[in-house]
């Protein structure tokens, strides 16, 4: 996926160095891995490991590669056509509502509830009431009320930082 594009994401303007490949735009657009020149005549390749573009575009600059935060692991590096993929470390997760940081998974469920879902890089453990089977959406329970569980194993990316 491409990263959302705002002013701070655009790589600083650099004149095309000799090693940067050029090609001609197609219908005014440049292919993934390139951006368009200021005069619109050339497609200039992004710089591997520094910036990227994922779609056909008329961007004046490629997008700056994301760096994974502490508390994240890099699943795949930035290429000219794909941003870095970062994932929360084991035992932590990132919610869609709070994508800024990885949060620690709960260690267990409240009394009277059972765990039906493990901690993953994109979700906390899931607890349901023993009798009704309804999900628990409360805060982290007090320690004496918990049934402990081990963190789940990492799977696919929780957040494509690009």
């Amino acid at each position: 996926e491409s990263a959302l594009i705002t002013q701070q994401d655009l790589a600083p303007q650099q004149r095309a160095a000799p090693q940067q490949k050029r090609s001609s735009p197609s219908e005014g657009l440049c292919p993934p891995g390139h951006h368009i020149s200021e005069d619109g005549r050339d497609c200039i390749s992004c710089k591997y490991g520094q910036d990227y573009s994922t779609h056909w575009n008329d961007l004046l600059f490629c997008l700056r590669c994301t760096r994974c935060d502490s508390g994240e692991v890099e699943l795949s590096p930035c290429t000219t056509t794909r941003n870095t993929v970062c994932q929360c470390e084991e035992g932590t997760f990132r919610e869609e509502d709070s994508p800024e940081m990885c949060r620690k998974c709960r260690t267990g469920c409240p009394r009277g509830m059972v765990k039906v879902g493990d901690c993953t890089p994109w979700s906390d453990i899931e607890c349901v009431h023993k009798e009704s089977g309804t999900k628990h959406s409360g805060e982290v329970p007090a320690v004496e009320e918990t049934v402990t569980s081990s963190p789940g194993t990492p799977a696919s990316p929780c957040s494509l930082s690009g």
């Epitope: 996926e1 990263a3 705002t6 779609h55 008329d58």
Partner: nanobody, 125 residues
Framework: QVQLQESGGGLVQAGGSLRLSCAAS????????MGWFRQAPGKEREFLAA????????YYADSVKGRFTASRDDAKSTAYLQMSRLRPEDTGIYYC??????????????????WGQGTQVTVSS
Amino acid sequence: QVQLQESGGGLVQAGGSLRLSCAASGRSISNYAMGWFRQAPGKEREFLAASVWNNGGNYYADSVKGRFTASRDDAKSTAYLQMSRLRPEDTGIYYCVVARTPETPITSARGANYWGQGTQVTVSS
């Protein structure tokens, strides 16, 4: 909070053109990314185009490359999608989106923080 309102949809014959507008209110969106998705009947929402701040350029899906042009006027807090050479398969509800953080993927529906109500585009053959 950002409110988005699309307009400009309608019925058009294959080969024709339409221009969609998306007016944002609630706060300045000059440093936000804006984009366009569509949902065809019975299908998932599909990324079409993403417009960067200050007319710095746009991203396009392969399916609309060369036919659709995204633009924006930050002074008016409005984004536009100029659609030409329309095809029957372009029929669907067109949504304007805004995403607020640099880490959010704008080319996936999950990455959009704010959605408009959508405007219907029907392309007849």
